[in-house]
């Protein structure tokens, strides 16, 4: 399997429509929770919480702040900790608790604490209860958590150092911890939990489980560094501890090693990231996305590996176990545990099987079973992917956070369909197409490129969006920016299976938002842009400009997949001789006009699509050069009417008898590039055209034309 | 002056492995796709594959791009060539060539010789 | 893939005169009015050398005897008049489809 290639098209920040929140002196906006039903987006950050429109995030709803008193700062700072930094209250847990309340914890100037937040009043009730286990200490440190049925599961540290990690169950009637051992959690990195409910036609009467991600030290290779390892476990939701042994403990605490590599290079990712688990109506069971990067990543390498769920089940259930053994001289500590196993299964939920044998709870597990899952808690089988390999593997690039979305195209296929945010504050839309990968677009989230830290994905039909949390705000994005594909063949070669090109409004539309039946759209998910109606109109841009000076013809191809060249009459230009040159790859750069070079230009790209290259015109030009005759008069500028009710500009600018000729604007470089020289700031008010005077008077006037295209295939 | 320069070719073993490079100078190149070309002796030329500006979009030559990368190193002017599990039909003259679009080479290099026999 | 078919295999024409070269693809290679097809001369011991490009265009440095026209499936290549120096293969190529392909190549030989 191939790097995945480089996104589509780039969209910057400026671009495309993108809502923002945040809010002055408010940082670390690391916790999102949306509730669809009321269309609001919770948010927890540095010492505050918000609730924004989910539709419109810039629109603030309600705020309370829970801030870290002087004194707690003091006492922090006296630990060696930063109090600007460190010694301040970081939102780590925002979870539903009820219809009107959120379970809210912070880390609280290392001092966590968790409290009850009343969303009619948008006050927290001041429970102040203890944090610890529920929440880090240090604000640097990995945390996890997910909220089943009013009781709270997390994964993170127990003390101050952070050196005690913790799965824990914080309940009034069953509070639930992991052990303190190293065969648990040996320095774990928490990544994600999440609860997985049993089918309701299960015949078997099993128990719900709840799933915790993360990334540890191995111990079943000890070499010369740290091997890192990533983990999925499971525990079950009716666990409540065993009697004697494993008093208050999970019983039913296993983990496996998550696969994810490139067999055929010997790529390793085993940094895990995140993760995302995929819900659909189509899914019998769900399927789990896991972002990786590799423990030695110097190159920037990223990959998403997909599972069943029911693989990783099976694992848990059928898997043979590991045990710790004391070889002399052996990078393996331990090995597959061959021996007898106890019964009822170790580590099993108690299911209607249990039940008949007279084991109602876990409470009533025999010690043997008790005693074999604490000794045992690794499983020796580990989870494979779908497909046994990456969906994608990228090279360049550091992703951070994932969500995928599973859409149906036009043709019934279905897509699923992954965005994943990067270190340097940018979002990636990718789809598997024939076993490749297709990264339709980047979309510049933040200006000023620092890491996504959170994402999150609304599910609700119609109103669509992804929502990114970083160090200084949130982010909204549409799902798409099918509109930003201004023709047929954009929209085609977009691949992106949210846009179709609709022939009667000659736009691009999204899918999801069309209410109309979607005969006569466009759709071609192979990227076959012949399936578009031919144009029957090409519509050039008419320039003027001035003999000896520079043109700049642009031609506006956003794809990065695409390459152009130019056509000046019916021959192909080779844009780098001393008359012609190209300026980011694009646009042509006439030199020293003359006569000579009027006529029309043509900007053509050309794109491969699997094995068929897609050529399209992207840009017309009318250039007409004329000799100016000096004006003796002083500059003028006239604004005068073209066609199509644009206005364009006449700029005359008048030169010195006797002076030297005017400089070019433009000067070529022997290695062939081209250096511009800075652009004079423009000139005028709001309500005039801004004119911009280059040393050579270039501009004279342009227009837009209609004329009847012969040359469409 | 544009120059491109193949190194890397030789004598080896059917199964084995070789590193083609091509030293570009003279242009930027960062600023161009570049492409290998093959020719078997006294034989006709085939396209073996090519690579967009900043080495993220390779194609290839679908009989071939199972054993074959192309890639490149900008801060070096390199292109290169990696492949594996030689045949004895890949025995041929490896050109390095620059890729104008649309889709013509201006510029070859000398070619490196590579012969794939036991 | 798009077969290039060159004929003649080779020639002898006489210094002076006009040598023609035709190539024939099994599909078209034209697309809004751009013409993929391009020649290339090569020598013994050289690489290809690019002598057109899109059909018709004359690469810089390439003396104007060398002429090339064509479109859709057809196209030839002229040199007019031939010199000395003008023996060599010629190749024909299309970059309209994936792969690339070339011709079989013509021989020229000078009288």
């Known amino acids: 399997m191939a790097f995945a290639p480089i996104p589509r098209i780039t969209w910057e920040h400026r671009e495309v429509h993108l809502v923002q929140f945040h809010e002055p002196d408010i940082y670390n906006y690391s916790a999102l929770l949306l509730s669809e039903d009321k269309d609001t987006l919770y948010i927890g950050a540095r010492e505050a919480v918000f609730a924004v429109n989910a539709l419109n995030i810039s629109e603030k709803q309600h705020e309370v702040y829970w801030k870290v008193s002087e004194d707690k700062k003091a006492k922090c700072a006296e630990k060696g900790k930063s109090k600007q930094t460190e010694c301040l209250n970081y939102i780590r847990v925002l979870q539903p608790l009820s219809a009107t309340s959120l379970y809210v914890c912070g880390t609280n100037a290392f001092q966590p604490a968790c409290d009850h937040l009343n969303l009619t009043s948008f006050k927290f009730l001041g429970k102040n209860e203890d944090g610890k286990g529920r929440c880090p200490f240090d604000p640097a440190h990995s945390y996890t958590s997910v909220m089943v049925d009013g009781e709270l599961y997390s994964g993170t540290s127990y003390n101050f150092l952070g050196s005690e990690p913790i799965i824990s169950r914080n309940s009034s009637h069953s509070p639930l911890r992991t052990e303190y051992a190293i065969p648990w959690l040996n320095e774990p990195s928490f990544v994600f939990a999440d609860v997985i409910r049993k089918s309701p036609d299960s015949p078997d009467g099993e128990d719900d489980r709840v799933y915790f991600f993360f990334t540890e030290v191995s111990v079943e290779y000890e070499f010369v560094f740290r091997v890192l390892i990533p983990r999925i476990a499971r525990v079950c939701k009716g666990d409540q501890g065993g009697l004697r042994t494993l008093q208050k403990k999970w019983t039913s605490f296993l983990k496996a090693r998550l696969i994810c590599s490139r067999p055929d290079s010997g790529l390793v990712f085993n940094v895990l990231r995140d993760v995302f688990v995929l819900r659909s109506p189509g899914l019998k069971v769900p399927v789990f996305y896991a972002l990786f990067t590799p423990q030695l990543n110097n190159v920037g390498l990223s990959a998403v590996c997909a599972y069943n769920l029911s693989t990783a089940e099976e694992v848990f259930s059928h898997g043979k176990y590991m045990q710790s053994t004391t070889v002399e001289q052996s990078h393996t500590k331990w090995v597959r545990y061959n021996g007898p196993v106890p019964k009822p299964r170790p580590g099993a939920c108690i299911d209607s099987e249990a039940r008949a044998a007279n084991y109602t709870s876990s409470l009533n597990l025999p010690d043997k079973t008790l005693q074999f899952v604490k000794d045992h808690p690794l499983m020796d089988d580990s989870v494979t992917p779908i497909d046994n390999r990456p969906r994608l593997i990228k090279k360049d690039v550091n992703y951070t956070q994932i969500v995928v979305d599973r859409t149906q195209a036009l043709d019934g296929t279905v897509y699923d369909v992954m965005f994943v945010s990067t270190d340097r504050g940018a979002l990636h839309k990718a789809i598997s197409l024939e076993h490749a990968v297709h990264i339709i677009e980047e979309t510049q989230l933040f200006q000023d490129f620092e890491p996504v830290q959170t994402l999150l994905l609304s599910s609700k039909k119609g109103n669509r969006f992804v929502y990114a949390g970083s160090n200084s705000g949130v982010v909204q994005a549409p799902l798409a920016f099918c509109g930003k594909h201004g023709t047929c063949e954009d929209c085609v070669l977009a691949r992106d299976p949210y846009c179709a090109w609709s022939p009667p409004t000659a736009t691009c539309v999204a899918l999801h938002q069309t209410e109309s039946p979607s005969r006569g759209l466009i759709q071609e998910m192979s990227g076959d842009a012949s399936v578009c109606p031919d144009k029957s109109k090409g519509s050039y841009r008419q320039h003027f400009f001035k003999h000896g000076g520079t043109a700049e013809l642009k031609c506006s191809q956003k794809s990065n997949l695409a390459r152009v060249f130019w056509k000046f009459q019916n021959g192909v230009l080779k844009a780098e001789s001393p008359k012609y040159g190209l300026m980011g790859r694009k646009n042509l750069l006439i030199f020293n006009l003359s006569e000579g070079d009027s006529g029309v230009y043509q900007c053509l790209s050309e794109e491969r699509v699997k094995n068929k290259t897609v050529f399209q015109v992207v840009a017309k030009h009318v250039l007409e050069v004329k000799v100016v005759p000096k004006p003796v008069v002083a500059p003028t500028l006239s604004v005068v009417q073209t066609e199509g009710s644009r206005i364009a500009t006449k700029v005359l600018v008048a030169s010195t008898q006797g002076s030297s000729p005017p400089t070019p604007a433009v000067q070529a470089t022997s290695s062939g590039a081209i250096t511009l020289p800075p652009k004079p700031a423009p000139t005028g008010t709001s309500c005039e055209p801004k004119i911009v005077i280059n040393t050579v008077p270039q501009l004279h006037s342009e227009k837009t034309m209609y004329l009847k295209s012969s040359d469409n295939r | 002056e544009v120059k491109l320069v193949e190194s890397g070719g030789g004598l080896v073993q059917p199964g084995s492995s070789m590193k083609l490079s091509c030293t570009a100078s003279?242009?930027?190149?960062?600023?161009?796709?570049m492409a290998w070309v093959r020719q078997v002796p006294d034989k006709g030329l085939e396209w073996v594959a090519n690579i967009n500006y900043d080495g993220n979009n390779p194609y290839y030559v679908d009989s071939l791009k199972t054993r074959f990368i192309i890639s490149r190193d900008n801060a070096k002017n390199i292109l290169y060539l990696q492949m594996s599990s030689l045949k004895s039909e890949d025995t041929a003259t490896y050109y390095c060539?620059?890729?104008?679009?649309?889709?013509?080479?201006?510029?070859w290099g000398q070619g490196t010789t590579l012969t794939v026999s036991s | 893939d798009i077969v290039l078919t060159q004929s003649p295999a080779s020639l002898a024409v006489s210094l002076g005169q006009r040598a023609t070269i035709s190539c024939r693809a099994s599909e078209s290679v034209s697309i809004h009015g751009t013409h993929l097809m391009h020649w290339y001369q090569q020598k013994p011991g050289q690489p290809p050398k690019l002598l057109i490009y899109?059909?018709?265009n004359l690469e810089s440095g390439v003396p104007a005897r060398f002429s090339g026209s064509g479109s859709e499936t057809d196209f030839t290549l002229n040199i007019h008049p031939v010199e000395e120096e003008d023996a060599a293969i010629y190749f024909c190529q299309q970059s309209i489809e994936d792969p690339h392909t070339f011709g079989g190549g013509t021989k020229l030989e000078i009288k």
């Open positions: 003279g242009f930027t190149f960062s600023d161009y796709y």
């Open positions: 060539a620059r890729d104008i679009s649309p889709g013509y080479f201006d510029h």
């Open positions: 899109a059909a018709s």
